[in-house]
């Protein structure tokens, strides 16, 4: 028979032969013959391979140092590479997370929008008119103005993105 | 029948080498891998390393830097050497046959004599 | 690399009573993939060379008699002989056949009262 061109899935061809691949986890040690199975062998501690291979080394599991403020998520397994996170207060600067950066605080006159996680900055946004934030905050939002009526006083001093409203109690009509 | 056959030195000078062939019969090198593993009072049973059927190598990492094995297909022989031996490699060295029996699953199924390996001036 | 610990290091049967013998591993034997456990059972009986009993945890050697049981999963394994004969009498080693460098452990001496 014409030796193939084309091998089978979970299958590679070398010297005019289909071998089988190494399944997720093992690596190859002896590429199959006529007479003989590909030969396998699991990754060591530490190690990985995510697919059907013909590797020979397999790969290191990602190191999540905690000097760039890492942390494991999820531990890895002979089949699946380790997910790092940052730190509480810290977000991953892309989405490898190969590093992290501290959380954005919204400045006075911004409130949270969106409170980080590991994997995403603080989104900010702007205090609407009747709204005020007087810190720099990564967890505040905007608050409400006070209501002087429902205390029963007036406004004295009109609030800003950044300053609530004073309020003061109402002028006396004199006798 | 399967048969593994060493030969070598029973004695050998500190920091020099130790060579030792394994002849086999009943079997191909092409097509089983062949193991090196010593035994010594203090340290039980070390596996120190392996020449797979296709003639790529493993070895302990604690042995890497000293030890060479290499094969003779043809001859159906493998070649063990470790250089700079001191007292604690005082050992009895085996050869023995790889076993594969799928998932990634090895063992060794035979063995050879052994030779017993005495380091001292 | 994996430490494999074995107990007791020695133990004595009279002929006809069932011996355990434990081993434990440092790391976990069992791949995830395959569901498999990749712990080997030699026996080396007095000025001899190691035997192949067991692979696999629990898959015996052709030739070696059933009377040789292995089981186990994860770190903790167990070589079990369910009516111990004279012929019997040796050192027994488990060794994770897991990955390289493969390790053995220290053996259990097996001694016929």
């Known amino acids: 028979p014409e030796p193939p061109t084309a091998c089978r899935e979970k299958q590679y061809l070398i010297n005019s032969q289909c071998c089988s691949l190494c399944q997720p986890g093992q690596k190859l040690v002896s590429d199959c013959t006529e007479f003989t199975e590909t030969e396998c062998l699991p990754c060591g501690e530490s190690e990985f391979l995510d697919t059907w291979n013909r590797e020979t080394h397999c790969h290191q599991h990602k190191y999540c140092d905690p000097n760039l403020g890492l942390r494991v998520q999820q531990k890895g397994t002979s089949e699946t590479d380790t997910i790092c996170t940052c730190e509480e207060g810290w977000h991953c600067t892309s989405e490898a997370c190969e590093s992290c950066v501290l959380h954005r605080s919204c400045s006075p006159g911004f409130g949270v929008k969106q409170i980080a996680t590991g994997v995403s900055d603080t989104i900010c946004e702007p205090c609407p008119v009747g709204f005020f934030s007087n810190v720099s905050s990564a967890f505040e939002k905007c608050h409400p103005w006070t209501s002087c009526e429902t205390k029963d006083l007036v406004v004295q001093q009109a609030g800003t993105n950044k300053t609530d409203v004073v309020c003061g109690p109402q002028d006396r009509l004199r006798a | 029948q399967v048969q593994l056959k060493q030969s070598g030195p029973g004695l050998v000078q500190p920091s020099q080498s130790l060579s030792i062939t394994c002849t086999v019969s009943?079997?191909?090198?092409?097509?089983?891998?062949l193991h090196w593993v010593r035994q010594s009072p203090g340290k039980g049973l070390e596996w120190l390393g392996v020449?797979?059927?296709?003639?790529?190598?493993d070895y302990n990492a604690a042995f890497m830097s000293r030890l060479s094995i290499t094969k003779d297909n043809s001859k159906s022989q493998v070649f063990f050497k470790m250089n700079s031996l001191q007292a604690d490699d005082t050992a009895i060295y085996y050869c023995?046959?790889?076993?594969?029996?799928?998932?990634?699953?090895?063992?060794?199924?035979?063995w050879g004599q052994g030779t017993s390996v005495t380091v001292s001036s | 690399d994996i430490v494999m610990t074995q107990s007791p290091s020695s133990l004595a049967m009279s002929v006809g009573q069932k011996v355990t013998m434990s081993c434990k591993s440092s790391?976990?034997?069992?791949?995830?993939?395959?569901?498999?456990?990749?712990l080997a059972w030699y026996q080396q009986r007095p000025g001899q060379s190691p035997k192949l009993l067991i692979y696999?945890?629990?898959t015996r050697e052709s030739g070696v008699p059933d009377r040789f049981l292995g089981s186990g999963s994860g770190t903790d394994f167990t070589l079990t002989i369910s009516s111990v004969q004279a012929e019997d009498l040796a050192d027994y080693f488990c060794?994770?056949?897991?990955?390289?460098?493969?390790?053995f452990g220290s053996g259990t001496k097996l001694e016929i009262k």
């Open positions: 696999f945890t629990s």
């Open positions: 009943g079997f191909s090198l092409t097509t089983y891998g």
């Open positions: 790391q976990s034997l069992l791949h995830s993939f395959n569901q498999k456990n990749y």
């Open positions: 023995a046959k790889n076993s594969y029996y799928g998932n990634g699953g090895h063992a060794m199924d035979y």
């Open positions: 020449i797979w059927r296709g003639g790529n190598t």
């Open positions: 060794q994770q056949h897991y990955t390289t460098p493969f390790t």
